[in-house]
Structures are given as C-alpha cells and as structure tokens.
C-alpha cells in the first residue's frame, strides 16, 4: 500500500509533468551477477549485442538476437518444426533533452529483446 | 554519435546527481501491441503476475513465473530432462522519495522476469 495514500499517482493526468530525479541508484548491486549462461544452454539460444547511446541513460543496453529460426533439439540439431522467438519487453530510459549539455531528460519507452524462447509455430490453414 | 560530444555521460562520476525529468513519454505507443501469446505457445510456458506499487513509476509491472520445472515436449508432456528458467532483466524505475506527496523521485534498479526459456540442465558430477 502507498506510503502517502492521498498522493496523486505518477501516472495520473494531474501529476506534474516534470519531476526531480536522483540518479544515485537504489539497489545498484541487486543481483548484478545475473549474467547467466542461459543464452548458450537454451533450446532457443541467442547472442547479445551491445546497444550504446551516450544521449541515453543507461547508455549501454544489451539486446538479444536469436541464433536460429528453429530450436535446438536434444541432439544439437536445429528443428524447424519449432521456432526461436525473441521475448521483448518495454523498458523506460532517460533521453537527454536536445539542449547543449542540459541536465534535463525525458522518459522514453524502448522495446528490447531480452532473450529467446522456443514456441510452436502458428499453423495457418490455406483455404 | 552523441549530439553533444563534449557533454559528460550521465553515468560519469562528475555528472549532477539530481536531474529534471519530463514524464511525457516519447515512443509511448511504440509496438504497444506486443502482448504476444508466446507465454502459452512456448516449450517453457509462463504465467504473468501483476506487480503494483503506487510509489513507483511505472506503478504496474508484469512478472513472468515459469509454469513447470521441466519443458513441454511435442506431445504436450513435461520433460524433466530439460528445465524451464526465467529470463531476467534489470530495469530502471522511479521510486518516489519518502517525503509526503513530493515530486522528487530516485532511480531504482529492479530485477524482473520477462519470460521463460528451456535450458539443458547443468549436470554436476559428484566426486
């Protein structure tokens, strides 16, 4: 439950559009060891690509790209009866406002691929 | 390349710790139709759970929980020779500072499960 039950939610229409944000991240080291090897051990393995943009915070975001169109079976062969697909998530990033070296940012939505999963294809019946 | 090549990166130590942020989201509707049915069609299917916190922005985040320990095979049976595991991602959220109805926020890191993937288990040989 909210600490301040009478406060407007930040998503409310009447909430101020500009707020102060402290960049000292809380939980900075929470689970920072999460670089697991799932990307290699998955039946829908993926590669990780570095997406860097100095005008954005965070400036580095890692994006997943599925290695295969199909999925890897128990023998290590690619089975095209199944498909590797990216799991995507919308995240919020801070985009520097386009005035020279300003300390003003704007929230921006980004769709990132986090990893891949193996799905049964949609079977389309042609009439 | 950056618009302002001489500007300090927002991750630099000498960057101001408090910045102004405009909450009018850019790319608000980017790919907003992405609610795919992968969670059902995956060999490592998952359920989506709503995580709500009015002191956070965004206040609602959906978290994935893998349905099975194993993975679903072509016949729809759970195969325990493989494991369903959550794909996790660190995201940034805004946490309202604990002063009554303040317009001050702090960046907070959250580890969220976005979906699940099917992996070969690590076999540990006991000496």
């Amino acid at each position: 439950s909210p600490q301040n039950p009478g406060c407007p939610n930040a998503e409310d229409k009447n909430f101020p559009r500009t707020v102060m944000v402290n960049l000292n991240i809380r939980n900075r080291n929470t689970n920072s060891k999460r670089a697991s090897d799932y990307y290699n051990r998955s039946s829908s393995p993926w590669n990780l690509h570095r997406n860097e943009d100095p005008e954005r915070y965070p400036s580095v975001i890692w994006e997943a790209k599925c290695r295969h169109l199909g999925c890897v079976d128990a023998d290590g062969n690619v089975d095209y009866h199944m498909n590797s697909v990216p799991i995507q998530q919308e995240i919020l990033v801070l985009r520097r406002e386009p005035r020279h070296c300003t300390n003003s940012f704007r929230l921006e939505k980004m769709l990132v691929s986090v990893g891949c999963t193996c799905v049964t294809p949609i079977v389309r019946h042609v009439a | 390349s950056p618009q302002n090549p001489g500007c300090p990166n927002a991750e630099d130590k000498n960057f101001p710790r408090t910045v102004m942020v405009n909450l009018n989201i850019r790319n608000r509707n980017t790919n907003s139709k992405r609610a795919s049915d992968y969670y059902n069609r995956s060999s490592s299917p998952w359920n989506l759970h709503r995580n709500e916190d009015p002191e956070r922005y965004p206040s609602v985040i959906w978290e994935a929980k893998c349905r099975h320990l194993g993975c679903v095979d072509a016949d729809g049976n759970v195969d325990y020779h493989m494991n369903s595991v959550p794909i996790q991602q660190e995201i940034l959220v805004l946490r309202r500072e604990p002063r009554h109805c303040t317009n001050s926020f702090r960046l907070e890191k959250m580890l969220v499960s976005v979906g699940c993937t099917c992996v070969t288990p690590i076999v540990r040989h006991v000496a």
């Epitope: 993926w46 590669n47 690509h49 790209k65 599925c66 290695r67 295969h68 169109l69 199909g70 690619v78 498909n83 590797s84 697909v85 990216p86 691929s113 799905v119 049964t120 294809p121 949609i122 389309r124 | 795919s36 992968y38 069609r41």
Partner: nanobody, 125 residues
Framework: EVQLVESGGRLVQAGGSLRLPCAAS????????MGWFRQAPGKEREFVAA????????AYADFVRGRFTISRDDARNTVYLHMTSLKPEDTAVYYC??????????????????WGQGTQVTVSS
C-alpha cells in the same frame, strides 16, 4: 520504417550462378529475420529462404536447399541470396522482405511487413 532495394537480377544460363543483394535503409534491419520470396509468372509468391536476426541460422524451401544460400551483412545493411545450379524453373521476380514482428513462423508471407520492388531473374535453357 525500412526501405528495401533488390538488385543483381538478369538473364543467366541454366547451371549458372547469381548473387542478389538487397540493400535496406532504416534502423530495424538488424532487429528481425529477413527473407527472400519469389513469384513466377501466373503463380503465387512463395517462400525461398530466411535468415535469423543474428545471421547464425537460415531456413530454405525444399526446392532451393543445397543450391541457394542466404546471408546478411549488418554493417552494410544488406541481405544476400547466392544462387547456384540455376534451373529454368527458377525464373521469377525475386523479392526481399523484412519483418517488424516475429510471430513464430518464418515462411509465411503475411509476417513480412516491408517488401522491395523485386528483381527479375531469368534462367534460359
């Protein structure tokens, strides 16, 4: 938005080879699988080949497997279809296609949102 421009199509003798480049402009090129389709006169457009986002894997229609190879060069924003052992039945307009969604199939035409104008390949006997 992605613009696709195919080139490299021409008249070639049976048994010959061709390489068709497809140049893409737009930021989404590297984000999703790309595909090649073809349409012969009086026939429906059909899947030829597709390549994964990472470029590590490709899938082919049975009728070109072993003869055609798809590849991508993300630095050049280009996808290639390398065609060998060409047959007269390979005569068609070849289209490059990009997808902006990925819904668990790679050979279904409707999954591809962006198309080039096509390049004509004619194989004479």
């Amino acid at each position: 938005e992605v613009q696709l421009v195919e080139s490299g199509g021409r008249l070639v003798q049976a048994g010959g080879s061709l390489r068709l480049p497809c140049a893409a402009s737009g930021r989404t090129f590297t984000s999703y699988p790309m595909g090649w389709f073809r349409q012969a006169p009086g026939k429906e457009r059909e899947f030829v080949a597709a390549i994964s986002m990472s470029g590590d894997d490709a899938a082919y229609a049975d009728f070109v497997r072993g003869r055609f190879t798809i590849s991508r060069d993300d630095a050049r924003n280009t996808v290639y279809l390398h065609m060998t052992s060409l047959k007269p039945e390979d005569t068609a307009v070849y289209y490059c296609a990009a997808r902006t969604s990925y819904d668990g199939t790679y050979d279904y035409i409707d999954d591809y949102s962006y198309w080039g104008q096509g390049t004509q390949v004619t194989v004479s006997s």
